[in-house]
Interface confidence: medium
Amino acid sequence: DNPERYSTNLSNHVDDFTTFRGTELSFLVTTHQPTNLVLPSNGSMHNYCPQQTKITSAFKYINTVISCTIFIVGMVGNATLLRIIYQNKCMRNGPNALIASLALGDLIYVVIDLPINVFKLLAGRWPFDHNDFGVFLCKLFPFLQKSSVGITVLNLCALSVDRYRAVASWSRVQGIGIPLVTAIEIVSIWILSFILAIPEAIGFVMVPFEYRGEQHKTCMLNATSKFMEFYQDVKDWWLFGFYFCMPLVCTAIFYTLMTCEMLNRRNGSLRIALSEHLKQRREVAKTVFCLVVIFALCWFPLHLSRILKKTVYNEMDKNRCELLSFLLLMDYIGINLATMNSCINPIALYFVSKKFKNCFQSCLCCCCYQSKSLMTSVPMNGTSIQWKNHDQNNHNTDRSSHKDSMN
């Protein structure tokens, strides 16, 4: 992750330290303050890349517009999603609780971090950079970013596990409400996300720097302990492994198991009796899968640029400028896509899930009116309870209605 319009280039310099979700831009500068300003080799400073700041300059304005759009869409979308799940008893169930947790994590990021980011881009400085509140924001900003992305990935993992559990124990009865196991999962997700974000809060500090003969401060990762130096070194790999690969691997494993489970139960009278029920579960599984795919698409460019920077880019290479330009461009696109992920889930649910679509429409117009969700219970086979909705599109069976109220 910066002063009162000292110059155009200074705001670019500040951008270089900007901590976006999951990374700090460190292409143009090192992410920590060197102990001395001695270059590694003779004359290496004389080989620099002139196009760096041009990309940064263009990005400044593009990112401001995108950030403002994400702020509005993310705030309205995630708040509406939370309202829908909170206000409608029929929507209060396991998977929806995880989706609400996902939305709340995104909402916190959108409401707190994005305004700081926009301020930093426009003002070209860290907010309150000369007082203690600025130091507090410097700790809070990356902490909430990592927490938010942690909440996202762990919720996606939990949703994948939940989909497998729903298929593996399809005959389990569940009424309206959030199962205890899901509630424990959500609490654990939030606690773990906060714990994993602690190094960010420790490592990020207000660091003074000189720019064109002026003294400024910026918020950046500044390793002072052995652990923080280690964290800084492995950070890109850790982010890639835990915050990107892990949810994808988790989804792949549990969706493979779920597919095997479904194929194993292909025949049998219960399968025929519960065809609608299974159809609903497939729809929910499809929705969860869609959220994971969107997550992967949003975060892949950023992680790729980080890893390429770590592995391919060589500061001493005389022909590095083209690669640096490409990596910078990729980084900026990646940053916007990654930030977009915090507002895209409600949009995805709107298009993928009929039930959410109906609720979004009614909630945004007025409220998600209860008349649409008048439930009547009908016993079925003595094992499950079918909830009939007056909407002919919804044929919900036990957890399809409560645990799986997405379609």
Epitope: N9, N12, D16, L28, L37, M45, E210, R212
Partner: antibody
Framework: QVTLKESGPGILKPSQTLSLTCSFS??????????VGWIRQPSGKGLEWLAH???????YYNPSLKRQITISKDSSRNQVFLKITNVDTADTATYYC??????????????????WGQGTSVTVSS | QIVLTQSPALMSASPGEKVTMTCSAS?????MCWYQQKPRSSPKPWIY???NLASGVPARFSGSGSGTSYSLTISSMEAEDAATYYC?????????FGAGTKLELK
Amino acid sequence: QVTLKESGPGILKPSQTLSLTCSFSGFSLSTSGLGVGWIRQPSGKGLEWLAHIWWDDDKYYNPSLKRQITISKDSSRNQVFLKITNVDTADTATYYCARRREVNFGINYYYSMDYWGQGTSVTVSS
Amino acid sequence: QIVLTQSPALMSASPGEKVTMTCSASSSVSYMCWYQQKPRSSPKPWIYLTSNLASGVPARFSGSGSGTSYSLTISSMEAEDAATYYCQQWSSNPPTFGAGTKLELK
């Protein structure tokens, strides 16, 4: 190859306005991280920094001369201009223009005047 | 503004002799630049970022220092090193030069 060449009136009278031009080649002032500055050196004396203009049009002036001097650029023509109003005999010196590079290193920025012109002699005499 | 005081103002050294000149700043600066100027010639960048030699500068030159005290050292004086050396900072506006150290050959 980077070259800078200063041009000026040579001789002028006190209270007149000194106009200097720095014509350069081998680089562009549209390129980020680059700037051009003016430095003067009275005969047998040390160097005195006067003004500087960056690629982003950020301008810096020596506070002791700020009321008198104006720096500007024409990036398309690869020229930087310096105007000193109301000159007196103390302004007699060799005036150099120099390219200044700005490269961020670590968190700080490093600046060097890596190319200099050969200088133009200016004499203020009544 | 930061005042840079160079000492000595004038010094002479024999070929092969070790030479050290200092530059003292009135306030702390992050790094120092050094320029070499010969008579009837424009200054040349000599040392940047306190200790890094500009291209073409012989390895016998070195720079060091921090805070308010910086120095330029020639490990073995040669005839071509006779010149005036200026230190310069831009840690604080305005950028300032030292008055120079004139190095002569004995």
